[in-house]
């Protein structure tokens, strides 16, 4: 029961996490204009992995895609790659984990196969979560570096007569979504791995025990047994997990120049 709950919860947590990673990857607000010096702005800039946007006081919002691959910073490309790898691994992990769920019957799939699939999906979720966290963290680090660089030369101009305020960018909502989503996927993966340990039957070798009854001697050599299903020899010599009492249904069978942070 605990195994099923752990596996199910791991699946749900991972599902939420992967949905969050997808959402974060698609979001435009990876970096947003820093409003510390000017909290009331008529033009608000924000940028995502795929496009940059400008929202005006008038309510008009214009977004422009990054229509170049070669012109983009290597770090941005790396972040994109990490997020995509995270999504792909997560999606495959979800697919595998669906078939690995104890509550779903697929033909006569053995517990050992389910255990292996659970472990595989768990590892995939862990890697997926790590990819997302790494991607978001690389982007955040890039933002912090650029923030302090632009703060150092906040105002540039001719002899200080004309001021050109450099737009500084800070953490956008997508970063927080990405961190949380990555964390959830990671936790979900760990839960799946824990559930796998419960699913995987341990090889139990029972030593022959001699019972000396009065009159005649009978030696019992029992095979493995399934609790609540009666004793019987393990004729197929397959691993059977003694998981305590189980109910019947629990038995498994526009190109333009942009600021890139």
């Amino acid at each position: 029961m605990a195994v099923t709950a752990c596996q199910g919860l791991g699946f749900v947590v991972s599902l939420i996490g992967i949905a969050g990673i997808i959402a974060a990857t698609c979001m435009d607000q990876w970096s947003t204009q820093d409003l510390y010096n000017n909290p009331v702005t008529a033009v608000f800039n924000y940028q995502g992995l795929w496009r940059s946007c400008v929202r005006e006081s008038s309510g008009f919002t214009e977004c422009r895609g990054y229509f170049t691959l070669l012109g983009l910073p290597a770090m941005l490309q790396a972040v994109r790659a990490l997020m995509i790898v995270g999504i792909v691994l997560g999606a495959i992990g979800l697919l595998v984990s669906i078939f690995a769920l104890k509550c779903i019957r697929i033909g006569s799939m053995e517990d050992s196969a389910k255990a292996n699939m659970t472990l595989t999906s768990g590892i995939m979720f862990i890697v997926s979560g790590l990819c997302a966290i790494a991607g978001v963290s690389v982007f955040a680090n890039m933002l912090v570096t650029n923030f302090w660089m632009s703060t150092a030369n906040m105002y540039t101009g001719m002899g200080g007569m004309v001021q050109t305020v450099q737009t500084r960018y800070t953490f956008g909502a997508a970063l927080f979504v990405g961190w949380v989503a990555g964390g959830l996927t990671l936790i979900g993966g760990v839960m799946m791995c824990i559930a796998c340990r419960g699913l995987a039957p341990e090889e139990t070798n029972y030593k022959a025990v001699s019972y000396h009854a009065s009159g005649h001697s009978v030696a019992y050599k029992p095979g493995g047994f399934k609790a609540s299903t009666g004793f019987g020899s393990n004729t197929k010599n397959k691993k059977i997990y003694d998981g305590g009492a189980r109910t019947e249904d629990e038995v498994q069978s526009y190109p333009s120049k942009h600021d890139y942070v």
Epitope: S58, G59, T167
Partner: antibody, heavy 118, light 113 residues
């Protein structure tokens, strides 16, 4: 056809109050950011207030902050400017405007005159 | 606050002449996010409210004759009328739309010789 009609102007004593109204028609009023702009007798233009569409964020220059309040009633398609603690320098023609791309004011009303004098 | 300075304050021209007026801002009006300059030009004829001519420094409002051209970037902007017509006699204002408070220039008055 877009139409903005201001009303509520008049003569008021210093320290007094006045509420200007702007009736909008010919466009989806609730979807647009609206502003008030005034023109002094010397023909200088000054931005007075802005109210965004949707959640209705408001913006004011320091010269009117705390004295003027911009508001809107989307059900009535009307923009308001509540003016209090009026000063002689508030004497001007007040225009109701609609904001468009580039934060530009694409439509202006005919204006309503406000005179602050004792 | 961004200070908008227009020059000259008045211009006397003859019909058909090419006219250029300047507008300078104390801070750059160029937004790095979309590479657009948040400067607007308005025309005001006597007894009328101002009328939008050009936004984003060079984008002509629909219905505005193509003899009106806006140019410039950063802090220096220009409004050019390629061939002045009698109906163009008015006061022209430039406005900062980049940051609050929105500020206007004092205007350039276009008069007929």
């Amino acid at each position: 056809d877009v139409k903005l009609v201001e009303s509520g102007g008049g003569l008021v004593k210093p320290g007094g109050s006045l509420k200007l109204s702007c009736a909008a028609s010919g466009f989806t009023f609730s979807s647009y950011t609206m502003s008030w702009v005034r023109q002094t007798p010397e023909k200088r233009l000054y931005w007075v207030a802005t109210i965004s569409s949707g959640v209705s964020y408001t913006y004011y220059p320091d010269s009117v902050k705390g004295r003027f309040t911009i508001s809107r009633d989307n059900a009535k398609n009307t923009l308001y400017l509540q003016m209090s603690s009026l000063k002689s320098e508030d004497t001007a023609m007040y225009y109701c405007t609609r904001l468009t791309k580039g934060n530009a004011m694409d439509y202006w009303g005919q204006g309503t005159s406000v005179t602050v004098s004792s | 606050d961004i200070v908008m300075t227009q020059s000259p304050s008045s211009l006397t021209v003859t019909a058909g002449e090419k006219v250029t007026m300047s507008c300078k801002s104390s801070q750059s009006l160029l937004n790095s996010g979309n590479q657009k300059n948040y400067l607007t030009w308005y025309q005001q004829k006597p007894g009328q409210p101002p009328k939008l001519l050009i936004y984003w420094a060079s984008t002509r409002e629909s219905g505005v004759p193509d003899r009106f051209t806006g140019s410039g970037s950063g802090t220096g902007f220009t409004l050019t009328i390629s061939s002045v017509q009698a109906e163009d006699l008015a006061v022209y204002y430039c406005q900062n739309d980049y940051s609050y408070p929105f500020t206007f220039g004092a205007g350039t008055k276009l008069e007929l010789k």
